[in-house]
């Protein structure tokens, strides 16, 4: 079957990093600089991405393979192979369209990257909050009120300074 | 234009070895892929052997562990060795790189 397709299609026989040359009588030629062909029996070799800018490059192009890129410092991936750079954000703030603000009261961002989301409603599962939630850091639910021995409190005294949540005037 | 240059052909026996040449002159950049093809009477020009843009020598499954390209930027020239020649390797080997090719060299491997 191989030496029929070859037969019928000699572009079939053209390997990775070449092209099947059409204004050459069909005949396999390598891919051009900054250009690659990942596959055989390609009739054109890809141009080589570049990582220009807020991007930077992970993997350099080859005559078989394309450049990877990343991110630079302050910046994450977005898309697939990471198609967009996306700005960082600290924990406890989330990336609007005026740039980074702080996590409304009742919600957290732990990472970087994403959206502040909001605390875990602990008595939803019957539980009591343990310790506070944060713009950081989302509640800790403990056990059950009723779980409780009576006169334990199950809440941590709140940190001396601003209340959770809000940023800083 | 690039003016390329095949020698080092010859008749051999199975078996034996022949070093083949390409000499370049004009401008020929070093990020220019190198290739070695071969011609067999009543057949298709075949690609053989290339070193690609990004300096990596390939080979198609012909020459795979029987020839070796090599090539050196400052003498403009480029080598196919050929070790283990068989009788279906006889045929005319041409150099090529960009557009240019050279008048080829026939390689005929005989006992």
């Known amino acids: 079957f191989e030496r029929t397709r070859s037969l019928q299609d000699p572009c079939s026989n053209c390997p990775a990093g070449t092209f099947c040359d059409n204004n050459r009588n069909q005949i396999c030629s390598p891919c051009p600089p900054n250009s690659f062909s990942s596959a055989g029996g390609q009739r054109t070799c890809d141009i080589c991405r570049q990582c220009k800018g807020v991007f930077r490059t992970r993997k350099e192009c080859s005559s078989t393979s394309n450049a990877e890129c990343d991110c630079t410092p302050g910046f994450h991936c977005l898309g697939a192979g990471c198609s967009m750079c996306e700005q960082d954000c600290k924990q406890g703030q989330e990336l609007t369209k005026k740039g980074c603000k702080d996590c409304c009261f009742g919600t957290f961002n732990d990472q970087k990257r994403g959206i502040c989301r909001p605390w875990t409603n602990c008595s939803l599962d019957g539980k009591s909050v343990l310790v506070n939630g944060t713009k950081e850091r989302d509640v800790v639910c403990g056990p059950s009120p009723a779980d409780l021995s009576p006169g334990a409190s199950s809440v941590t005294p709140p940190a001396p300074a601003r209340e959770p949540g809000h940023s800083p005037q | 234009a690039v003016q390329l240059v095949e020698s080092g052909g010859g008749l051999v026996q199975p078996g034996g070895s022949l070093r083949l040449t390409c000499a370049a002159s004009?401008?020929?950049?070093?990020?220019?892929?190198m290739s070695w093809y071969r011609q067999a009477p009543g057949k298709r020009r075949d690609l053989v052997a290339w070193?690609?843009?990004?300096?990596?020598?390939h080979y198609t499954d012909s020459a795979k562990g029987r020839f070796t390209i090599s090539r050196d930027n400052t003498k403009k020239t480029t080598w196919l060795q050929m070790n283990s020649l068989k009788l279906e390797d006889t045929a005319v080997y041409y150099c090529a790189s960009g557009d240019s090719w050279g008048q080829g060299t026939q390689v005929t491997v005989s006992s």
């Open positions: 004009g401008d020929i950049f070093s990020s220019q892929p």
């Open positions: 070193i690609a843009w990004d300096n990596i020598a």
